[in-house]
């Protein structure tokens, strides 16, 4: 059981993907901190020449949904929805393979950006994955 909060997204960096949907946050005032972190991460990504168009098309919304996960409306307690494991793996191993290798070896990016670990996500056919966030 989580002990976080569900609250409307109130930032701008990810507004195109999230709108004003309800997102899960571990503490009431965490959104601002994460907004600043993701802005800093996007700045680093944007100023590096390591991001291909095919990768960014899916990586940017994926990072937004990872940083600001939708709340699981089916749950009786505040609970985040996971990214879908199959999409996470396609992103990591196919669309953004080069970019992931670069990011994982770059401490400046790792400092600002928490990359999703696909292995932590529920298996595609499991009940836990039924409500995952599809990009």
């Amino acid at each position: 059981e989580e002990d976080g909060f569900c609250q409307p997204y109130r930032g701008i960096a990810c507004a195109r993907f999230i709108g004003n949907r309800t997102v899960y946050m571990e503490s009431l005032h965490m959104q601002g901190e994460i907004e600043n972190q993701i802005t800093a991460a996007f700045t680093m990504i944007g100023t590096s020449s390591h991001l291909s168009d095919k990768c960014s098309q899916f990586a940017i919304p994926s990072l937004c949904h990872y940083a600001f996960p939708y709340c699981d409306e089916t749950s009786s307690v505040p609970k985040p929805r996971d990214l879908c494991r199959d999409e996470c793996e396609i992103l990591e191993n196919v669309l953004c393979q080069t970019e992931y290798i670069f990011a994982r070896s770059n401490p400046m990016i790792l400092m600002r950006l928490k990359l999703p670990n696909c292995e932590d996500l529920p298996q595609p056919e499991s009940p836990e994955a039924a409500n995952c966030i599809r990009i």
């Epitope: 109130r10 930032g11 701008i12 960096a13 990810c14 507004a15 195109r16 993907f17 009431l28 005032h29 601002g32 907004e35 600043n36 802005t39 800093a40 996007f42 700045t43 944007g46 100023t47 940017i60 937004c64």
Partner: antibody, heavy 118, light 107 residues
Framework: EVQLVESGGGLVQPGGSLRLSCAAS????????IHWVRQAPGKGLEWVAA????????QYADSVKGRFTISADTSKNTAYLQMNSLRAEDTAVYYC???????????WGQGTLVTVSS | DIQMTQSPSSLSASVGDRVTITCRAS??????VAWYQQKPGKAPKLLIY???SLYSGVPSRFSGSRSGTDFTLTISSLQPEDFATYYC?????????FGQGTKVEIK
């Protein structure tokens, strides 16, 4: 040197349209949120709209939602405010300003006056 | 939307005076508040961000503080160039909102 320069203001009739431009220089345009803030004659500041060019995400004040559209052209380092269905109460000096994260508007343009009158 | 109620709307003070302006948020905004100074015919200037952080180049006589949903801008010793209008603004949630402004005039 960071610079924001607004243009496009002028006199327009109620119901008319106008497009404001905000030309940015001296910083990485797509990394900052660009805002429009207005100030009616003798009144206080009112935030109007914002765009984060990197993700093309936008936000609007309720008073302009559905009438105004903010956009950005990263190749020209310019943000725009398309204002339609203008009303007398939209008369104001319009400023563009930039922000990084949630740290306040650190640079502002000089402002451009929009007058809506018949 | 979050309302920022600023007081007083105007005040008269003399050079050397200590001046305090307050802003109350209608709900919790954490420390996501900025303060600006504006002179007639000019764009506003950022003074304080994150409730109490002094923006680069701003004199140290300006300071900001927070107590719950109450925010204070203090000018420790008013200088001639400080006569202006001051605005608070919340950064916690879009739409961003400003206080009504406080005009600091010469007594």
């Amino acid at each position: 040197e960071v610079q924001l320069v607004e243009s496009g203001g002028g006199l327009v009739q109620p119901g008319g349209s106008l497009r404001l431009s905000c030309a940015a220089s001296g910083f990485t345009f797509s990394s900052y949120v660009i805002h429009w803030v207005r100030q009616a004659p003798g009144k206080g500041l009112e935030w109007v709209a914002a765009i984060y060019p990197y993700t093309s995400s936008t936000q609007y004040a309720d008073s302009v939602k559905g009438r105004f559209t903010i956009s950005a052209d990263t190749s020209k380092n310019t943000a725009y405010l398309q204002m339609n269905s203008l009303r007398a109460e939209d008369t104001a000096v319009y400023y563009c300003a930039r922000s990084y994260g949630t740290g306040g508007f650190d640079y502002w343009g000089q402002g451009t006056l929009v007058t809506v009158s018949s | 939307d979050i309302q920022m109620t600023q007081s007083p709307s105007s005040l008269s003070a003399s050079v050397g005076d200590r001046v305090t302006i307050t802003c109350r948020a209608s709900q919790s905004v954490s420390s996501a508040v900025a303060w600006y100074q504006q002179k007639p015919g000019k764009a506003p200037k950022l003074l304080i961000y994150s409730a109490s952080s002094l923006y680069s180049g701003v004199p140290s006589r300006f300071s900001g503080s927070r107590s719950g949903t109450d925010f204070t801008l203090t000018i420790s010793s008013l200088q001639p160039e400080d006569f202006a209008t001051y605005y608070c603004q919340q950064w916690y949630s879009y739409p961003l909102t400003f206080g009504q402004g406080t005009k600091v005039e010469i007594k």
